[in-house]
């Protein structure tokens, strides 16, 4: 069966995920036999998680970040909050607004020319065997003079677009997020009724490619809410 | 460099309880998804257990569910297996590792369950 | 669940020659969520390629990975002595994450 796939790039025209509920976590939703639709898929739990407005960084705009609204707050209680310009304090890269990352709890800009060699072997095998990452720890070692800048391909693992090559944008995937491919047109898309929905997702589709969005396909108006089709159209 | 040290095996009677953990050094913990992956003596490898960077979002095999618990301390950059109920075809080798693909993996450490 | 099938069981070679293990899946696997790994006695599994094709840090480049669908490939282009070892192949594409039962390249 297809079991999870169900929210994955690859798969096309096929019935979008339910709404962004999904019953009581854990449990399986389902609207044809045999298939299970992300969020409620059968290998998942949700912990700590809340519904509205965030539980993960990849939850909320790509100028904010999933935190307590508060310090040293209620860690259940998470809403998105505006990123953090440049040389404002940060704990992780999701943190520091898009340009930037976190690199000794300060979010610096990451077109510096030592981003690629200084930031230590990490994250995704992406970028090759050179293959630096997005982590905030010096390598301290020297690497040669040419600059690092491939990105992830396909299936690497990512912290967030721009670790991802042209064409891929960076989502969830279970508990990771990888480098997807951007939607083309009459490609199925997820779109949010609200800010934070999207958190049942076990699967994160990318955003339809430039030109395109995310409409209700059009022989699918009658049909009910949770079954809507989306696709990438035209504007 | 990325480090991943595992502990906590050890020799367990049926329906016992066992609490692995997994020390993580050389990368930003709370950045990466975290996954347990086990190997039966003589065996191939088999997924157990996956968790976010939050730790908001947990997975789980068939064979392990509702026995086992995975969880997370990013403050300590230590992953957690807590095994409970354990049965004779748990016995195996646990391994760590970094990510959906494991880029990263611990030593291993071995979960003998046997009366 | 997605079954992942390698052929060989077990490849016979000697150094110097190339050694081409296929990994298998039940079902399309649509991208290229497929990882290599390989292992020694002993030790834990090393990632030698992930997203079907690209190379993870440091791994020699007479290791390649190719395929898509349901078929894929690692290719050794000429093997050296500390190559000999099991490789298994991962999917990630959907839960359960599998993994191929291994093959053994052992020395002729």
């Known amino acids: 069966t297809l079991n999870s796939v169900l929210n994955s790039n690859a798969i096309k025209n096929l019935p979008p995920p339910l709404g962004g509920a999904a019953g009581h976590p854990g449990s399986a939703v389902s609207a044809a036999p045999g298939i299970l639709y992300p969020g409620g898929n059968k290998y998942q739990t949700i912990d700590n998680y809340q519904p509205y407005p965030c539980a993960e960084d990849e939850e909320c705009g790509t100028d904010e970040y999933c935190a307590s609204p508060t310090r040293g707050g209620d860690a259940g209680v998470q809403i998105c909050l505006a990123c953090r310009k440049r040389r404002k304090r940060c704990m992780r890269h999701a943190m520091c607004c898009p340009g930037n990352y976190c690199k000794n709890g300060i979010c610096v800009s990451s077109d510096q020319n030592h981003f690629r060699g200084e930031i230590e072997e990490t994250i995704t095998e992406s970028f090759g065997n050179d293959h630096s990452t997005l982590d905030g720890y010096s390598r301290r070692t020297t690497l040669s003079s040419k600059m690092y800048h491939t990105k992830g391909q396909e299936g690497s693992v990512c912290l967030r677009s721009s670790d991802c090559a042209s064409g891929l944008c960076c989502a969830r995937h279970f508990w990771s997020k990888i480098c997807k491919p951007v939607l083309k047109e009459g490609q199925v898309c997820t779109k949010h009724r609200r800010k934070g929905s999207h958190g049942l997702e076990i699967f994160q589709r990318c955003y339809c490619g430039e030109g395109l969005s995310c409409r209700i396909q059009k022989d699918h108006h009658q049909a009910s809410n949770s079954s809507r089709l989306h696709t990438c159209q035209r504007h | 460099q990325v480090q991943l040290v595992e502990s906590g095996g050890g020799l367990v009677q049926p329906g016992g309880s066992l609490r692995l953990s997994c020390a993580a050094s050389g990368f930003t913990f709370n950045n990466y998804g975290m996954t347990w992956v086990r190997q039966a003596p003589g065996k191939g490898l088999e997924w157990v257990s996956g968790i976010s960077g939050s730790g908001s979002y947990t997975y789980y095999a068939d064979s392990v569910k509702g026995r086992f618990t995975i969880s997370r301390d990013n403050s300590k950059n230590t992953l957690y297996l807590q095994m409970n109920s354990l049965r004779a075809e748990d016995t195996a080798v646990y391994y760590c590792?970094?990510?959906?693909?494991?880029?990263?993996w611990g030593q291993g450490t071995l979960v003998t369950v046997s009366s | 669940d997605i079954v992942l099938t390698q052929s060989p069981a077990t490849l016979s070679l000697s150094p110097g020659e190339r050694a081409t293990l296929s990994c298998r899946a039940s079902?399309?696997?649509?991208?290229?969520?497929l990882a290599w790994y390989q292992q020694k006695p002993g030790q834990a599994p090393r990632l030698l390629i992930y997203g079907a094709s690209n190379r993870a840090t440091g791994v020699p480049a007479r290791f390649s990975g190719s395929g898509s669908g349901t078929d894929f490939t690692l290719t050794i282009s000429s093997l050296e002595p500390e190559d000999f070892a099991v490789y298994y192949c991962q999917q990630y594409m959907t839960l359960p994450l599998t993994f191929g039962q291994g093959t053994k390249v052992e020395i002729k």
């Open positions: 590792a970094r990510t959906i693909y494991m880029d990263y």
């Open positions: 079902q399309n696997l649509f991208s290229p969520y």
